[in-house]
């Protein structure tokens, strides 16, 4: 028996549901009776599911996980997995004997957008050129941890005296917090980009300064 | 009409350096930042680097940080990207071109004709 | 880096027929410009924001994509349409370019 997954991770966002792709080819006159399927987490070899014996023997793993039976006797072995968690994030194997063996590995890479970033400015009153001042930029709820950039009005990166900071929180959902200190010129936007590296996904926010009062701008 | 006039062709030694330049008009010089982009056969476009024209802050392409330095005169307009330690390498059409956009969201606009720099001895 | 790769490197249209070239990132980018360059000249910019045409472009000319993949098209090729065009990506430093595809009549 050969058994076949997707070689390219399967990304699931946090709380959907994501499906584990794995099959085989049945010889004519397979029956069900023949089939034994493990899934487990390839590093720590925990039992994930299996069918064993002509049955289901339902999920080992948090009650979350579900076969397609109707599927398996045409070879699809894949595994639903619900109610995704950053903590599903890993490689799982799918094991299939009938008469001989095998196994092949998927990877899960769980993800989970960034909000739109929210600009503070400290301090945010009596600003003339040269003060220094400190803009953070806010993203929160995201996974994995998050690229950011920083950009002046002219689109030219600002790489200098940039500070970020990434904090997990019980779910394992990362709020990011950078911090640009600049000198003020006589006016200048600044621009924060909050990236998404599974996800391609980018957020961003930015603030003008012209003298007085500040400017948040709309998001294009 | 917005317009970027760029210096003359080089012909330079191998091992010195070349200081070329591009005057901006017809625009706020100060509100867009300029680009350096390089054009060989060997290896079509190459971006160089930026500099914001009105705080003189610089991005270089980690390729060309130590080969291209980029400066400002903003009462004249002008950027101006110095090569050094030349070699046949460089030999090269440079172009200057004008970054236009917003937020994270840019493209060049508007290009200089060219500076040929051709490196023999 | 952003690498960006066109294709084909070469092709060759006949008058009227519709030409299409592609431009694939390595990475999602948020739009794709395109640049025309015809011989000893320097780029003028072509496409912007992945769709939009410059201006003083002829309308035969198309931009689509997202992501990865995108790619520009000409619905009637004509004589004047000679060139190479480059795609850009100004999503992530250092910017880049594609090699070019260059275009040529037959």
């Known amino acids: 028996v050969e058994v076949q997954v997707s070689e390219d991770p399967v990304v699931a966002l946090v709380d959907t549901d994501a499906t584990l792709r794995c099959s085989f080819s049945p010889e004519p006159g397979f029956s069900l009776a023949q089939l034994n399927l493990i899934w487990q987490l390839t590093d720590t070899k925990q039992l994930v599911h299996s069918f064993t014996e002509g049955r289901d023997q339902g999920s080992a793993y948090s009650n979350r996980t579900a076969l397609f039976p109707d599927l398996l006797v045409q070879g699809n072995a894949s595994l639903r997995l619900q109610r995704v968690r950053v903590t599903d994030e890993g490689s799982y194997t799918c094991f299939v004997s009938i008469q001989d063996f095998d196994s092949a590995a998927v990877s899960l890479q769980v993800a989970a957008p960034y909000s739109k970033p929210s600009m503070t400015l400290e301090p945010n009153k009596d600003l003339r050129p040269g003060n220094m001042v400190t803009i953070t930029c806010s993203s929160y709820q995201g996974y994995p941890e998050a690229e950011v950039f920083w950009k002046d009005g002219q689109g030219v990166p600002l790489t200098g005296n940039v500070t970020t900071s990434q904090m997990a929180n019980e779910r394992g959902l990362f709020d990011v917090h950078s911090v640009l200190r600049v000198v003020l010129g006589a006016n200048g936007t600044y621009s924060c980009l909050v990236r998404n590296p599974v996800l391609q996904q980018d957020a961003h926010g930015s603030v003008t300064i012209t003298g007085q009062p500040l400017t948040f701008p709309p998001e294009a | 009409e917005v317009q970027l006039q760029q210096s003359g062709p080089e012909l330079v030694r191998p091992g010195v350096s070349v200081k070329i330049s591009c005057k901006g008009s017809?625009?706020?010089?100060?509100?867009?930042?300029m680009h350096w982009v390089k054009q060989s056969h060997a290896k079509s476009l190459e971006w160089i680097g930026v500099i914001n024209t009105s705080s003189g802050n610089t991005y270089y392409n980690l390729k060309f940080k130590g080969k291209a330095t980029m400066t400002v005169d903003k009462s004249s307009s002008t950027a101006y990207m110095e090569l050094a330690r030349l070699t046949s390498e460089d030999s090269a059409i440079y172009y200057c071109?004008?970054?236009?956009?917003?937020?994270?969201?840019?493209?060049?606009?508007?290009w200089g004709a060219g500076t040929t720099v051709t490196v023999s001895s | 880096d952003i690498v960006m790769t066109q294709s084909p490197v070469i092709m060759s249209a006949s008058p009227g027929e519709k030409v299409t070239m592609t431009c694939s990132a390595s990475?999602?980018?948020?739009?794709m410009h395109w640049y025309q360059q015809k011989s000893s000249t320097s780029p003028k910019l072509w496409i912007y924001?992945?769709?939009k045409l410059a201006s003083g472009v002829p309308g035969r000319f198309s931009g689509t994509g997202s992501g990865k993949s995108h790619s520009l098209t000409i619905s009637s090729m004509e004589a004047e349409d000679v060139a190479t065009y480059y795609c850009f990506q100004g999503s992530g430093y250092p910017l880049t370019f594609g090699s070019g595809t260059k275009l040529e009549i037959k």
């Open positions: 017809g625009y706020t010089f100060t509100d867009y930042s």
């Open positions: 924001d992945t769709s």
């Open positions: 071109s004008k970054y236009y956009g917003s937020s994270f969201h840019w493209y060049f606009d508007v």
């Open positions: 990475s999602s980018v948020s739009y």
